[in-house]
Each structure stands twice: as C-alpha cells, then as structure tokens.
C-alpha cells in the first residue's frame, strides 16, 4: 500500500499515513503529498532546515530515519520493494535560496535490492532542473559512510557527506550537509543538483517523491 492507493481510497489530504510493505504486514510511516500534480505521491526524501543529520549508516538508510513531518529518508528497503512491484515515476522538487523552484521528473524509477546495493535505475528525464540528469547514468550503487560502493578511489560519502548514489563522485547529492542562507555557496559537501545550480551551491529544500506510472 502506497500513497497512490491511499489517495484512490478517498483520503486526499496531505499528511502522514501508514504504508505497508508489498506482500507483507510490515508497516512504515510516510508523508503523502496529495496536492502536487494530482496527488498520490509517496515522499521518500525531504530536506528543509538541517534539523536531521543525514550522515548516517547503511542500516539507517536501509530502514529510514527522521520524521515524515519534517526532514526524513523513507528507507531504501521499502522503496526497493515498492518500485520492484510496479513501474514508478520519480519527481524531485528543488528550492534555492533566491526563491526559485525547479523539478526533475523521471518516467521510470526503481531501486535494485540490497544485494545490488540499492542501485538506482532511471530513464526519461524531463523538467526544469537541467536537461542532463544530475543523477549519473547508468545508475550507481548506493554508498554510505560505512559502505563504500562508489566508482571513486576516494570515499565519496565521507568526503561529500550523506548516503547517495555516488558515481565518482558525480553531479548530485541531495543528502549532503545542510548549509543555511549566506553560508550555502562554495560548499563542496552541500546539497547539490549540479545541472540546475552548478557546483558548490547548497540548496534550501529538496523533496523526492514517487508515484505509480499509471496513476
């Protein structure tokens, strides 16, 4: 059960809902965005104020952390299982410190299982946050401070902070160090979406959300 199913059941107010893992009774709490683009979006990541530390372990990124009412990571295992069942789209919403907003929409998104290090798969980019994907293609394995699966002889997660699908180390990291306004430029380990704001610019807010492609 995801936010799209909840929306279709008649619950159309954005907020925290209890979702269930596919083919399981295991539950997880998530923020459902029922307003953006027709609603039904399961929010899998959100940054807004730096209140949550995103330099976490593999286990924490696997299971999720933070609060769905604020900053959080839903959890790689749930997202992997969910996106393995049906075709999902991924929408990434970004805000800078100058009041601008942009988005990237991928028309097919899924995460491989833990045995494949939750490798990300993405196709079909559209949107206003750059014509080139800021998540390297083909998709990379997920890396954290205690699980280095990137393509760099360095350790991307330790240098750039946070868990992410680092390449070597690549043009994005929405789980980087949060920097407040006036401290957000020329930061090499911040919240980055290169093909929108270039290098060294740390964003104000980010949201990653998924929804079935046939919603």
């Amino acid at each position: 059960r995801d936010c799209a199913e909840i929306f279709k059941s008649g619950l159309t107010t954005s907020g925290i809902y209890t979702l269930t893992f596919p083919n399981s009774t295991e539950e997880i709490k998530a923020y459902c965005d029922m307003d953006v683009g027709g609603g039904g979006w399961t929010v899998i990541q959100h940054r807004e104020d730096g209140s949550v530390d995103f330099q976490r372990t593999w286990k924490e990124y696997k299971e999720g952390f933070g609060s769905p009412l604020g900053e959080y990571w839903l959890g790689n295992e749930f997202v992997s299982q969910l996106t393995g069942q049906h075709r999902y789209v991924l929408k990434i919403q970004l805000k800078d410190w100058e009041g601008n907003e942009a988005h990237s929409l991928y028309d097919h998104f899924y995460l491989a299982g833990e045995e494949s290090n939750y490798r990300i798969h993405l196709t079909g980019l559209t949107g206003t946050a750059g014509k080139i994907s800021s998540i390297s293609q083909p998709g990379s394995d997920f890396s954290t401070k205690d699980s280095d699966n990137d393509k760099c002889i360095c350790k991307c997660s330790q240098m750039l902070s946070g868990g992410w699908w680092f390449d070597a180390c690549g043009p994005s990291n929405l789980n980087g160090q949060y920097y407040p306004q006036k401290q957000n430029t020329n930061k090499f380990n911040g919240i980055k979406w290169y093909y929108w704001k270039g290098s060294g610019y740390s964003l104000k807010a980010t949201t990653m959300m998924i929804r079935p492609a046939d919603f």
């Epitope: 330790q158 240098m159 070597a168 690549g170 930061k187 090499f188 380990n189 290169y194 290098s199 060294g200």
Partner: antibody, heavy 121, light 107 residues
Framework: QVQLVQSGVEVKKPGASVKVSCKTS????????FSWVRQAPGQGLEWLGW????????NYAQKFQGRVTMTTDTSTSTAYMELRTLRSDDTAVYYC??????????????WGQGTLVTVAS | DIQMTQSPSSVSASVGDRVIITCRAS??????LAWYQQKPGTAPKLLIH???SLQTGVPSRFSGSGSGTEFALTINSLQPEDFGTYYC?????????FGGGTRVEIK
Amino acid sequence: QVQLVQSGVEVKKPGASVKVSCKTSGYTFSNNGFSWVRQAPGQGLEWLGWISGYNGNTNYAQKFQGRVTMTTDTSTSTAYMELRTLRSDDTAVYYCARDQDYSNFHWLDPWGQGTLVTVAS
Amino acid sequence: DIQMTQSPSSVSASVGDRVIITCRASQGLSSWLAWYQQKPGTAPKLLIHSASSLQTGVPSRFSGSGSGTEFALTINSLQPEDFGTYYCQQANSFPLTFGGGTRVEIK
C-alpha cells in the same frame, strides 16, 4: 586524451591588459571547471580564481578581485583569463588547469603548458 | 583563507631513501587535499588527491596520508626522476591555496 593548450608568450607594458586562452579537447567541457594559477620566477604557485565550464560561475581570489575576469566559450571549448592594470610583479607563468567541477573536486589535472607573461616598460 | 604550511622547504636525499614531506592546514580539511610534483620548466602534475588516493599512472612508491589538519607525502625508495618541487593544495573551500613547496634534490 585530455589536453589543455594555452596561448603564447605575452610581453606587456605596465597598466596594460593581457588575455590568455586555454583551449581544451578530449572530454566534456561542461562537466568541468578551470582554475588559473600563476608562478612568478623562482616562486611557488598562486591561485587567481576559478570558472565553471557548465554555467560560467566564477570565484576569484580576493587579491585579484576587480582586476581579473575569467570567461568560457563553450562553442570552442576554450577558457579565458584577462588580467588588467598590469604591474611588473605580475610577471609570471600563468597556467590553466582543469578540475572535476561536477563532482566538486577542485584538484587540478591536467594543466596547460603555461603562458609566460612579462610586464616591463 | 586556509593557510597551508609545508615542511621542510628543501630536502637532499640519496636514491633509495625514503622522503617524507608534511603539510599543515590552518583549519580542518577532512580529506580535501592534493599533492603535485613540478619539474623545472614544466607544469605541475597531480600525484595524489583525496589525501591518499594515487592518481592514475603515478608510481606506487608515492603515497599520501593524513586527514584534518596534518598530511604527509611519502616517497619510498627515491628515484632519480623524483627530483623537483612538491606542493600540497587544499580543495576544501575557495580560495584554493597551495603550500610553499618542498624542493627535493638527489644527492
């Protein structure tokens, strides 16, 4: 392979300007940035500033602020550095060097061959 | 600005010797440090980045270590072609800054 080829030797009078070019080949220009570094005779390395090959964002060393301008021409994959109001102590070899801007890695590889700028009356 | 202090300023060593060059940063860099080699009349060449990652094609006798504010470049079994000046560079924040250099001479 990746190459950075700089323009030739320049001799300038005090108060003049110089514009050095750095033509690149062998990689995706927009994924990288360029630092400009100079080396006065017998001295160490001094960073002048940086420009993004993606969007032209710049960051200049405080010492050169207002006197240096860095630009790029994506159509020719070329970076430029102009230094104005030249003084005799600006005599140096000026290098351009590439970084992995899109990864936020600002170590420099490769470097151009260098351009000797001599300022003398 | 982050100040980078290199020592020694010069060293004279024999072929086969181990040479250690240190670099101290005025504030913590995590692992955002690179080492370069420069021979007379040529441009610097990147040897090591991320404090300890050897650049492709660089001989394994070169190694880097350290994090935070203290870093070192070690040349194991110095070779005749290793003469030149070595520089450290911080890549933690703009402005990028270099150490003053260490001149390595072969005895």
